[in-house]
């Protein structure tokens, strides 16, 4: 009786997702069989996140606007370690937008979800940001510094990276 | 080239108002923000504000609010800057710089003299 | 807002001359910190920024250095077309701030 409540409510969940995503791939959590955590196919995980390269060029507001319809944000790096894991899947010579931005052009940046702005944990190139008119980040190679990020105009087409929490059923 | 064409000088009564101009040629116009920039014998130069000619939205030295007003027209590549109320204290040379690269204002108009006089 | 001083205002040296101009922020500006030359018609030209970067165009005579709160302008061999005001300006923080202008004569 508990297993089928469980596996309904299993159901239930997997059916919210699939007006988004018609296809997860889930793996067990630790021991126990009750707990799976699941990404969107061909999504990538790390920690408690799903990552989406998308390849099509567009400006900053329609890629975040292209994220969120598939119910996640534009990437908001937080560590060393998660901008390792990501820049496995990107291509060095594209540019990918991050869900960074300076709205009003006076240095003052926001992630998209809100998490504070911390300049201790920044990968800017660099010399970078530089530009008051360059009001999106970017990830992108360079060949003196590998990768990191660099301000550029909102409106230049660019591919991009979105994020979203891990689905846990 | 880039250039930076500044409207004449002015010579005004005090109380009023002027709006002076500044149209940008041989570059892309609304990839570059726009500075006002003043200069007066007291003060040496001082930074007024800038305006994106891209957003139309501005930022403003706290000393110049309610002085100052930054628009833009994309239309003709022209940035203008009003100054209301003048007093003998915005006797001055007024230019235009265009937004570049670090932090830098890489290209100036010729300037605009501004004499308010009774 | 940050304070751009500029301890000399004004300064004499002889063509050919080595001549160097400093600019001291109230506060470290990382290195963003940019020199202009004001000729006597006003003329107004961007001459190095990011410290050390020289503008399209200007003679490799002008270098810029420093870091942190301290900087400098240096002419390495003097021309007659030298003669102007030279004002720093830092663009790390809003609002922008300029030094008081050093004004270059001929001795």
């Known amino acids: 009786n508990f297993m089928y409540s469980k596996t309904v409510k299993r159901l239930s969940k997997l059916r919210e997702y699939q007006q988004y995503h018609p296809s997860l791939t889930c793996v067990m959590e630790g021991k126990d069989i009750e707990d799976w955590s699941c990404c969107p196919t061909p999504w990538t995980s790390f920690q408690s996140s799903c990552y989406f390269i998308s390849t099509g060029m567009q400006s900053w507001t329609k890629s975040q606007k292209n994220c969120s319809v598939m119910g996640a944000d534009l990437v908001v790096i937080n560590t060393r370690e998660e901008q390792d894991f990501i820049i496995q899947n990107l291509k060095r010579n594209s540019s990918y937008f991050l869900g960074l931005s300076d709205p009003g052009g006076r240095r003052h940046w926001q992630w998209v979800d809100q998490t504070p702005y911390n300049e201790n944990v920044t990968f800017w190139h660099s010399g970078e940001p530089n530009n008051l008119d360059e009001r999106c980040a970017i990830i992108n190679f360079r060949s003196s510094e590998e990768w990191g990020w660099n301000d550029i105009h909102c409106h230049v087409p660019q591919k991009s990276i979105c994020k979203m929490k891990k689905i846990y059923i | 080239q880039v250039q930076l064409q500044q409207s004449g000088a002015e010579l005004v009564r005090p109380g009023v108002s002027v709006k002076i101009s500044c149209k940008g040629s041989?570059?892309?116009?609304?990839?570059?923000?726009m500075h006002w920039v003043k200069q007066s014998h007291a003060k040496s130069l001082e930074w007024i504000g800038v305006?994106?000619?891209?957003?139309?939205?501005?930022n403003y030295n706290q000393k110049f609010k309610g002085k100052a007003t930054m628009t833009v027209d994309k239309s003709s590549t022209t940035a203008y800057m009003e100054l209301a109320r003048l007093t003998s204290e915005d006797s001055a040379i007024y230019y235009c710089a265009r937004n570049g690269n670090f932090y830098v204002m890489d290209y100036w108009g010729q300037g605009t003299s501004v004499t308010v006089s009774s | 807002d940050i304070q751009m001083t500029q301890s000399t205002s004004s300064l004499s040296a002889s063509l050919g001359d080595r001549v160097t101009i400093t600019c001291q922020a109230s506060?470290?500006?990382?290195?963003?910190l940019n020199w202009y030359q004001q000729k006597p018609d006003g003329t107004v030209k961007l001459l190095i920024y990011?410290?050390?970067n020289l503008h399209t165009g200007v003679p490799s005579r002008f270098s810029g250095s420093g870091s942190g709160t301290d900087y400098s302008l240096t002419i390495s061999n003097l021309q007659q077309e030298d003669i102007a005001t030279y004002y720093c300006?830092?663009?790390?923080?809003?609002?922008?701030?300029f030094g008081g202008g050093t004004k270059l004569e001929i001795k």
């Open positions: 041989g570059y892309t116009f609304t990839d570059y923000s």
């Open positions: 300006q830092q663009g790390n923080t809003l609002p922008w701030t």
């Open positions: 990011y410290t050390s």
């Open positions: 506060q470290d500006i990382s290195n963003y």
């Open positions: 305006i994106s000619t891209y957003y139309g939205d501005s």
